[in-house]
Interface confidence: medium
């Protein structure tokens, strides 16, 4: 709305940088062939690039990434009883970000 | 995969708490009747609840919210020239979070 301007602080752009995000660990990251198990923890923190750039034609992108393997519990339910196993999930952390030009494909003439 | 367990750290649950997120300011928050303008900044930071809870039947939810009005620029394009106006957008910040029981509707018998 265009009203109540007095109390409003000027909006500050969310700059293009890494922020902590929550990543949901889906079961198919661990085992695509079997659905009869649970994963613990169900979510973890990752570092991801987010925010806006000063120009419309650029986008906030990761310029440096790091793969980080973490151990999770694969809880298989066999005859209503759990069997705990370890599994490794590889997470992607963004270490640095940059505002990158969006390359739009040119129409073929 | 169940391989390469040695190098992997145990995964730590992303606890239910407020984290900084990026909120895209869409034009229809400012004016639903007109599309012939731009908004600056296009995105801002907000505090939002995210993460997982220890229990299957609970979800991370905001227990306390605060509305925060911010001033943005509405840049109208009139005859190819920009006209700058002020507009207020009200953002929702989460101040506190809790793991709340998910109420699943019981089937009618």
């Amino acid at each position: 709305s265009l009203g109540s301007l007095a109390a409003a602080e000027p909006a500050v752009i969310a700059e293009c940088k890494t922020r902590t995000e929550v990543f949901q660990i889906s079961r198919n990251l661990i085992d695509r062939t079997n659905a009869n198990f649970l994963v613990w923890p169900p979510c973890v923190e990752v570092q991801r690039c987010s925010g806006c750039c000063n120009n419309r034609n650029v986008q906030c992108r990761a310029s440096q990434v790091q793969m980080r393997p973490v151990q999770v519990r694969k809880i298989e339910i066999v005859r209503k009883k759990p069997i705990f196993k370890k599994a490794t999930v590889t997470l992607e952390d963004h270490l640095a970000c940059k505002c990158e030009t969006i390359v739009t494909p040119r129409p073929v003439t | 995969s169940l391989g390469s367990l040695a190098a992997a750290e145990p995964a730590v649950i992303a606890e239910c708490k407020t984290r900084t997120e990026v909120f895209q300011i869409s034009r229809n928050l400012i004016d639903r009747t007109n599309a012939n303008f731009l908004v600056w900044p296009p995105c801002v930071e907000v505090q939002r609840c995210s993460g997982c809870c220890n229990n299957r039947n609970v979800q991370c939810r905001a227990s306390q919210v605060q509305m925060r009005p911010v001033q943005v620029r509405k840049i109208e394009i009139v005859r190819k020239k920009p006209i700058f106006k002020k507009a207020t957008v009200t953002l929702e910040d989460h101040l506190a979070c809790k793991c709340e029981t998910i109420v699943t509707p019981r089937p009618v018998t």
Partner: antibody, heavy 120, light 107 residues
Framework: EVQLVESGGGLVQPGGSLRLSCAAS????????MSWVRQAPGKGLEWVSY????????YYADSVKGRFTISRDNSKNTLYLQMNSLRAEDTAVYYC?????????????WGQGTLVTVSS | SYELTQPPSVSVAPGQTARISCSGD??????VHWYQQKPGQAPVLVIY???NRPSGIPERFSGSNSGNTATLTISGTQAEDEADYYC?????????FGGGTKLTIKR
């Protein structure tokens, strides 16, 4: 204060029964799995039984299977262990303990224990 | 049934590093926890999920687990670390404890 308090221990004759209780306070009891662990005098720890947060999963050590029953009343924040057909080798301090997650995991909170003596 | 084997006793001089082992078949495939128990007291969790320390546990306590052996390491041992230590793993449908290790701090 977050705590677990066991009660119901005592002297019982072989073949007799006893019901142990564990009162939880200071945390949301219904969100946690629970276990009973025992320790015979001068011996090590022995896991006895486990129950999931909602009571749907229960399992037991082979040494007590068919004689002991674990249960919980989430409305009363209380864990139980019904012990039947007691034997001399069941003599031990019985601890109730909390798992931090609904599925189990480590035991992050223990009660002070209640002594059960099976003797004629 | 699954078994975890610990040495009955370990002795170390104050300030030195104590290592307590826990062995079991393919133990590295399971998460191991360690508990400390002092005479007349309930056990206390000191390490969980192989190597994580609960809040309030001193940094001198650390853990590792690979292959068939998990190890609890106490660096710079202090007199108050004298206690019984138990490893534990949740395997097929049951929580298993090792037989316990008595840690003695030589005076």
């Amino acid at each position: 204060e977050v705590q677990l308090v066991e009660s119901g221990g005592g002297l019982v004759q072989p073949g007799g029964s006893l019901r142990l209780s564990c009162a939880a306070s200071g945390f949301t009891f219904s969100s946690y799995a629970m276990s009973w662990v025992r320790q015979a005098p001068g011996k090590g720890l022995e896991w006895v039984s486990y129950i999931s947060d909602d009571g749907s999963l229960k399992y037991y050590a082979d040494s007590v299977k068919g004689r002991f029953t674990i249960s919980r009343d989430n409305s009363k924040n209380t864990l139980y262990l019904q012990m039947n057909s007691l034997r001399a080798e069941d003599t031990a301090v019985y601890y109730c303990a909390r798992h931090p997650y609904w599925y189990g995991g480590q035991l992050d909170l223990w009660g002070q224990g209640t002594l059960v003596t099976v003797s004629s | 049934s699954y078994e975890l084997t610990q040495p009955p006793s370990v002795s170390v001089a104050p300030g030195q590093t104590a290592r307590i082992s826990c062995s079991g078949d393919s133990l590295g495939s399971y998460f191991v926890h360690w508990y400390q128990q002092k005479p007349g007291q309930a056990p206390v969790l000191v390490i969980y999920d192989d190597s994580n320390r609960p809040s309030g546990i001193p940094e001198r306590f650390s853990g590792s687990n690979s292959g068939n052996t998990a190890t609890l390491t106490i660096s710079g041992t202090q007199a108050e670390d004298e206690a019984d230590y138990y490893c534990s793993a949740f395997t097929h449908n049951s929580d298993v404890f090792g037989g316990g290790t008595k840690l003695t701090i030589k005076r």
